[in-house]
Interface confidence: low
């Protein structure tokens, strides 16, 4: 996958869009993380609705949100009040079984606001962190669930 | 129905390379992920990788990523697997299999087999 | 890669009896989804394998309802409750939680 650009400007939103084949990914939730170096685990920031037919409807995890187009087959992903810190390699993902699927992979890069004079050395990029088998595999991370989400789905 | 037919029994020289088919039927070819799986003679099975016909997306087991390349031909609905640089290590039977999508929530499973083709890499 | 483990490599029944086959994996099988991706083939001789059970305990369509799957994390397990001469063979547990897909290396189920 080559990667996508996404400028926005610190303090305002971002949209990012990913476009997909809506035939292959049909019935997959779909999920925004945030990557960890080049070979490190993507770490997941915010997924689509637990209910599939209910993707459009937008979550939001902090000040990201995710909402998806599941017959155009388009994911959005919007970063209200882009700061410096939000800066780095994303993935959005499709929630494949029992993969995660690359959709796209995003550079998000913060501009600072001309009316903001802060030092641009606060531009923050991930280092490097370990190495991990495969980069397909969905990688956990413990969060607060958001109001109305089930921690896990039945389990088998 | 479903079916998956393989190509018929291979006599191979070592060193030569191999081409292997899986004609699908009965089923949205291009839409399924479509597995490729080792079998040697008294033995276990080996998972080789994965091929999504759709657009051509694949999946190798690392050890068969240099010899083995997976395609397919969404317009004979035929899935392909090509061996090269054979050794006595590679006879065995190949076996195509479709992966289950038990949609919305994929079981990744293999539903439907081939029935084998059968590959003997003798001088 | 994930290496299955399956015990016993040879099952000696008799026809009637309950049968009981184990599966182990190296790590966890609980994808970070939150579902197990455990799956269970019967290969009889000179054929290909054919899916019994997938996700640990969802028969599929046309398994009669003697087989049963079952376990968590690591460990699993296929019982056959009475065992008939149509299901002799061998049975391979196989895991697609991580790529690579692996399988175990197979039980062989025969007439005692």
């Known amino acids: 996958h080559n990667t996508t650009v996404f400028q926005g400007v610190a303090g305002q939103s971002l949209q990012v869009s990913c476009p997909y084949d809506s035939m292959k990914h049909w019935g997959r939730r779909k999920a925004w993380c945030r990557q960890l170096g080049e070979k490190g685990p993507c770490q997941r920031v915010v997924s689509t609705h637990n209910l599939w037919l209910l993707s459009f409807l937008r979550r939001w995890n902090g000040s990201t949100a995710i909402t998806d187009d599941t017959l155009g087959g388009t994911l959005t992903i919007t970063l209200r009040n882009l700061q410096p810190h939000d800066a780095g390699l994303y993935q959005c993902q499709s929630l494949a079984g029992s993969e995660a699927d690359t959709l796209r992979k995003v550079l998000v890069e913060v501009l600072a606001d001309p009316l903001d004079h802060r030092d641009a050395g606060d531009l923050w990029f991930p280092g490097e962190s370990e190495s991990f088998e495969d980069a397909h595999v969905e990688h956990s991370i413990s969060r607060s669930l958001l109001e109305g989400e089930i921690p896990f789905p039945p389990t088998s | 129905q479903v079916q998956l037919q393989q190509s018929g029994p291979e006599l191979v020289k070592p060193g030569a390379s191999l081409k292997i088919s899986c004609k699908a039927s009965?089923?949205?070819?291009?839409?399924?992920?479509m597995n490729w799986v080792k079998q040697r003679p008294g033995k276990g099975l080996e998972w080789i990788g994965r091929?999504?016909?759709?657009?051509?997306?694949?999946n190798y087991n690392g050890e068969f990523r240099v010899r083995a390349t997976l395609t397919a031909d969404t317009s004979s609905t035929t899935a392909y697997m090509q061996l090269s640089s054979l050794t006595s290590e590679d006879s065995a039977v190949y076996f195509c299999?479709?992966?289950?999508?038990?949609?919305?929530?994929?079981?990744?499973?293999?539903?439907?087999w081939g029935q084998g083709a059968s590959v003997t890499v003798s001088s | 890669d994930v290496v299955m483990t399956q015990t016993p490599l040879s099952l000696p029944v008799s026809l009637g009896d309950q049968a009981s086959i184990s599966c182990r994996s190296s790590q966890s099988l609980v994808h970070s989804n939150g579902y197990t991706y455990l799956h269970w083939y019967l290969q009889k001789p000179g054929q290909s394998p054919k899916l019994l059970i997938y996700k640990v305990s969802n028969r599929f369509s046309g398994v009669p309802d003697r087989f049963s799957g079952s376990g968590s994390g690591t460990d699993f397990t296929l019982k056959i409750s009475r065992v008939e001469a149509d299901d002799l063979g061998v049975y391979f547990c196989?895991?697609?939680?991580?790529?690579?897909?692996?399988f175990g290396g197979g039980t062989k189920l025969e007439i005692k």
């Open positions: 091929i999504y016909p759709g657009d051509g997306d694949t």
């Open positions: 196989s895991q697609s939680t991580r790529v690579p897909y692996t």
């Open positions: 009965g089923y949205a070819f291009s839409s399924s992920w």
């Open positions: 299999a479709r992966l289950l999508r038990n949609q919305p929530g994929e079981s990744y499973a293999m539903d439907y």
